[in-house]
C-alpha cells in the first residue's frame, strides 16, 4: 500500500509549555534561529544541568515558549496545542533509511511502495536540546526571525546539526559535525 | 510517573477476535512512535508491529500483518490492537512499547494476557 | 528478516562470578546513520522486560556499571563483571536498524 511521507506539512515553531514540560525530548525545533548556529561547537553542559528535570530550568508552569523575536511586551496569540504538528520524539531508525533512500530517487511523496518500505521521519537526535535552547535564550535573545522550515528536508538539515545528547558527541551523526550553541 | 496499562485481554474462543488497550500516561504520547510485542507462555519475544504518531504510518511484521490491526488515539492516549481469527498459537502476553532507540526511556507495560481455548 | 542468535541457551553461575552472554545477527546491524541499533534486555521472572543496554553499549539509566554490552557489526556481547541474585532471569538482544525489528531466542540466567 502506498502512503504518503508524514509530517510535511509547515511546522508552527510557537509551542506551549505544556509541550515541553510533557516531552522528555523535545525536538530541534524547540530552539529555533541562533546567529551562526552551525558554525559555533557543541555545548557541554555540567552534569547537573543535564540531569535536572525539564520544568526545574522553565521559567514558570504557565509560561509560554515563544520564538525569540516576539518581544515580551506582547503576548503571543493562544496556540491550540492539538493543531501543532509536532515531530515525533522515537521514529525507528529504519524509517530513517527509507527517507534517505527516498531523497537520494529525488522524490518526496506520490511512490508506491512495499509493506516494509516505509517513507521516514527524521530521527530526533536532540533529548537535551530545550535546556540548551532554555540557557541560550537568557543570554542572547535573537532579534532575526525564526528559520520558516516548510520544507521537510529543512528541518532534516536544521535537526542533524544538534547533537542528540550534549554529553554525547560521539554520537552525532557522521554527516554532520557536532556543533556549539553558544 | 510513566505508566502503559495493557487491558482487554482473557480467554476467547478460536476463531474469534478481541481488542486490546494500552492507556499510557507520564510522556507526550501524541509524539511518539508506540509499539505492540507479544509473548507466548515459555517462549520468546515477537515483534508485532508500530504506529507512528498521527497513525498515518503502520508497520507489521510481515508474517503476522493479516491478523492484527494497530490503531491509537490521541484524545484518549490509547493505543489499541485488534487481534482476529484467534488461533491457539495467539495465546500470549501482549505488551505495549514504547521503544526509544538513540537514548535512555524505553517503557514497557505489564502486559495482557490473552488465552485462546474452545 | 534479521536473526538474532543468543548462546548461550541456559547459564548457570555463581553469585560474585562474571557471565557473558553472546547475540550473533545474520547481518550487519551497522545503520547508514554510522550507529548500532542494538538493545539487550531483562526480563525478571514474572515482570515485563525492562531495556539495560541501547545502542550497544550504552547503560540505561538505574542500570548498574556491572553490565557492559559490546561489539560491532554482526557479533555482540553482554557481560556481568560480578553476577547478584537480582540478575537473574531472561536476557534478550534486540535489533531495530532492519525492518521488522527481531529479538533473539533469549538466554536464561540462573543462579547455582
Known amino acids: 500500500t502506498g502512503t504518503k511521507i508524514a509530517y510535511e506539512t509547515k511546522v508552527d515553531l510557537v509551542q506551549t509549555s505544556e509541550a515541553i514540560q510533557e516531552s522528555l525530548y523535545p525536538t530541534a525545533q524547540l530552539c529555533p534561529s541562533f546567529e551562526e548556529a552551525e558554525a559555533t561547537p557543541s555545548p557541554v553542559l555540567p552534569d547537573i544541568v543535564m540531569e535536572a528535570p525539564l520544568n526545574s530550568l522553565l521559567p514558570s508552569a504557565g509560561a509560554s515558549v515563544v520564538q525569540p523575536s516576539v518581544s515580551p511586551l506582547e503576548a503571543p496569540p493562544p496556540v491550540s496545542y492539538d493543531s501543532i504538528k509536532l515531530e515525533p520524539e522515537n521514529p525507528p531508525p529504519y524509517e530513517e533509511a527509507m527517507n534517505v533512500a527516498l531523497k537520494a530517487l529525488g522524490t518526496k511523496e506520490g511512490i508506491k511502495e512495499p509493506e516494509s518500505f516505509n517513507a521516514a521521519v527524521q530521527e530526533t537526535e536532540a533529548p537535551y536540546i530545550s535546556i540548551a535552547c532554555d540557557l541560550i535564550k537568557e543570554t542572547k535573545l535573537s532579534t532575526e526571525p525564526s528559520p520558516d522550515f516548510s520544507n521537510y528536508s529543512e528541518i532534516a538539515k536544521f535537526e542533524k546539526s544538534v547533537p542528540e545528547h550534549a554529553e554525547l558527541v560521539e554520537d552525532s551523526s557522521p554527516e554532520s559535525e557536532p556543533v556549539d550553541l553558544f | 510517573e510513566v505508566k502503559l496499562l495493557e487491558s482487554g485481554g482473557g480467554l476467547v474462543q478460536p476463531g474469534g477476535s478481541l481488542k486490546l488497550s494500552c492507556v499510557v500516561s507520564?510522556?507526550?504520547?501524541?509524539?511518539?512512535?508506540m509499539s505492540w510485542v507479544r509473548q507466548a507462555p515459555g517462549k520468546g519475544l515477537e515483534w508485532i508491529g508500530e504506529?507512528?504518531?498521527?497513525?498515518?504510518?503502520?508497520n507489521y511484521t510481515p508474517s503476522l500483518k493479516d491478523k492484527f490491526i494497530i490503531s491509537r488515539d490521541n484524545a484518549k492516549n490509547t493505543l489499541y490492537l485488534q487481534v482476529s481469527t484467534v488461533r491457539s498459537e495467539d495465546t500470549a502476553l501482549y505488551y505495549c512499547?514504547?521503544?526509544?532507540?538513540?537514548?535512555?526511556?524505553?517503557?514497557w507495560g505489564q502486559g495482557t494476557s490473552v488465552t485462546v481455548s474452545s | 528478516d534479521v536473526l538474532l542468535t543468543q548462546t548461550p541457551l541456559t547459564l548457570s553461575i555463581t553469585i560474585g562470578q562474571p557471565a557473558s552472554i553472546s547475540c550473533k545477527s545474520s547481518?550487519?546491524?551497522?545503520?547508514?546513520?554510522?550507529?548500532?541499533?542494538l538493545n539487550w534486555l531483562l526480563q525478571r521472572p514474572g515482570q515485563s522486560p525492562k531495556r539495560l543496554i541501547y545502542?550497544?553499549?550504552k547503560l540505561d539509566s538505574g542500570v548498574p556499571d556491572r553490565f557492559t554490552g559490546s561489539g560491532s557489526g554482526t557479533d555482540f556481547t553482554l557481560k556481568i563483571s560480578r553476577v547478584e541474585a537480582e540478575d537473574l532471569g531472561l536476557y534478550y538482544c534486540?535489533?531495530?536498524?532492519?525492518?521488522?525489528?527481531?529479538f533473539g531466542g533469549g538466554t536464561k540466567l540462573e543462579i547455582k
Open positions: 534486540w535489533q531495530g536498524t532492519h525492518f521488522p525489528q527481531t
Open positions: 507520564g510522556f507526550d504520547f501524541r509524539r511518539n512512535w
Open positions: 545502542l550497544v553499549s
Open positions: 512499547v514504547r521503544p526509544v532507540w538513540m537514548y535512555a526511556m524505553d517503557y
Open positions: 504506529i507512528n504518531p498521527d497513525s498515518s504510518k503502520i
Open positions: 547481518q550487519s546491524l551497522l545503520h547508514s546513520d554510522g550507529k548500532t541499533y
